[in-house]
């Protein structure tokens, strides 16, 4: 975990000075050091540092919590509130966000961000696809042609004067329409069915 | 609260490793140093080792040669192995959690019972 | 490594009377890092008293701990049901962490 906080094991002690001169303070441990001439060390309890765990540990500005974790130092233990997404004692595992959630109706998991959406197949929404949608809802169909609800999707009946899949194209007194080339049998007026 | 759980086989050969497993049931395996520590059958207590996830590790040099302490923060668990047992190493082996203001045990686990024979 | 000498190894006592247990360390024990333990029998031991005096969470106040260098005691007030066990003493400043062989507090 190199991205947390350094090793809380004490520098090597002062020469002379041994364990049962109680070296180590705010609970430490005195390893080794038995006799004066062979160093001592000091483990610290989390939270201090310092060769004779003498200093206390601001363990939130070493940003110990990846992935925008919150970092809360309580003294005795150090604690990260993850983001959506994230999970572990350091927010250090990007969870799966689409594991166990299915789509239905057909929907596809798409994930990131932490987080997980469906894309809906069509005539579906809601967050789980799960509800039918109203593809009227936005009034898709242009210039005064009406809508009507189809299994495949929706159809416009274009108001007279007016044709394509949206009634977005005018026909012109001629016949003509800005349609590029209107499809074999289709006359302006009939319903266009939007796919 | 906390709570431990040791986990592992209850009969071991001689000669053979001693795997057991501790898991801690929240998150705080990283704020905290976690402990071994065994109990032969109507005997008294003996410290093994603890780790911190830093790495950190401490043995008892009286098993020092046998025993490797590992933890993995992903699972929640830090673990126990001892070679090479023998008859003296049948114990209750507790894990516990080491208090943090100083290296005494506030959290135990509930104790596995480890038989050594053939 | 420091030794533990517990005294004495078996505490015959009633319901309400005082124990006086004793744990004395084969070399001074730095900073009073001393702790007391009650185990019941086929549980855990549990953590009484940290730094020679504090009581940990949840203990109650008839649990006492005093001493420094060598010498350290801990005291039941007045003696519980529930407080019929073995204690053990441990010391937390120099490794290894030892333990003392306990103290067996038994109904009288």
């Known amino acids: 975990y190199p991205y947390d906080v350094p090793d809380y094991a004490g520098m090597l002690g002062s020469s002379g000075v041994t364990c049962a001169d109680g070296p180590c303070f705010n609970g430490g441990l005195c390893v080794g050091g038995a006799d004066p001439d062979s160093a001592y060390i000091c483990h610290c309890p989390p939270g201090f540092q310092g060769s004779n765990c003498e200093k206390r540990v601001d363990r939130c500005s070493l940003q110990p919590c990846r992935n925008g974790g919150l970092c809360l130092d309580l003294g005795h233990a150090l604690r990260c509130r993850c983001r959506a997404g994230f999970a572990g004692p350091r927010c250090e595992h990007d969870l799966d966000d689409c594991a166990g959630r299915a789509c239905a109706n057909g929907g596809t998991c798409v994930e990131g961000g932490g987080a997980h959406r469906c894309s809906c197949a069509l005539g579906f929404g809601g967050r789980d696809c799960r509800e039918r949608a109203d593809p009227c809802a936005a009034r898709p169909c242009a210039h005064g042609g009406r809508c009507y609800a189809h299994f495949s999707g929706l159809v416009c009946a274009c108001a007279p004067g007016y044709m394509g899949a949206r009634c977005e194209f005018p026909v012109h007194p001629d016949g003509a329409s800005a349609l590029p080339a209107a499809p074999p049998g289709l006359r302006p007026g009939d319903p266009q069915r939007y796919l | 609260q906390v709570q431990l759980q040791e986990s592992g086989p209850g009969l071991v050969k001689p000669s053979e490793t001693l795997s057991l497993t501790c898991t801690v049931s929240?998150?705080?395996?990283?704020?905290?140093?976690w402990s071994w520590i065994r109990q032969p059958p109507g005997k008294g207590l003996e410290w093994i080792a603890y780790i911190y996830y830093s790495g950190t590790t401490n043995y008892n040099p009286s098993l020092k040669s046998r025993v490797t302490i590992s933890l993995d923060t992903s699972k929640n668990q830090f673990s126990l192995q001892l070679s090479s047992v023998t008859a003296a190493d049948a114990a209750v082996y507790y894990c516990a959690r080491v208090f943090h203001w100083g290296f005494a045990f506030d959290i135990w686990g509930q104790g596995t019972m480890v038989t050594v024979s053939s | 490594e420091i030794v533990l000498t517990q005294s004495p190894g078996t505490l015959s006592l009633s319901p309400g009377e005082r124990a006086t247990l004793s744990c004395r360390a084969s070399q001074r024990v730095s900073n009073t890092y001393l702790a007391w333990y009650q185990q019941n029998p086929g549980q855990a031991p549990r953590l009484l008293i940290y730094g020679a005096s504090s009581r940990a969470t949840g203990i109650p106040d008839r649990f006492s701990g005093s001493g420094s260098g060598t010498d350290f005691t801990l005291t039941i007030s007045r003696l519980e049901p529930e407080d019929f066990a073995v204690y053990y003493c441990q010391q937390y400043g120099t490794s290894p962490l030892t333990f003392g062989g306990g103290t067996k507090v038994e109904i009288k």
């Open positions: 929240d998150n705080s395996i990283s704020n905290y140093y």
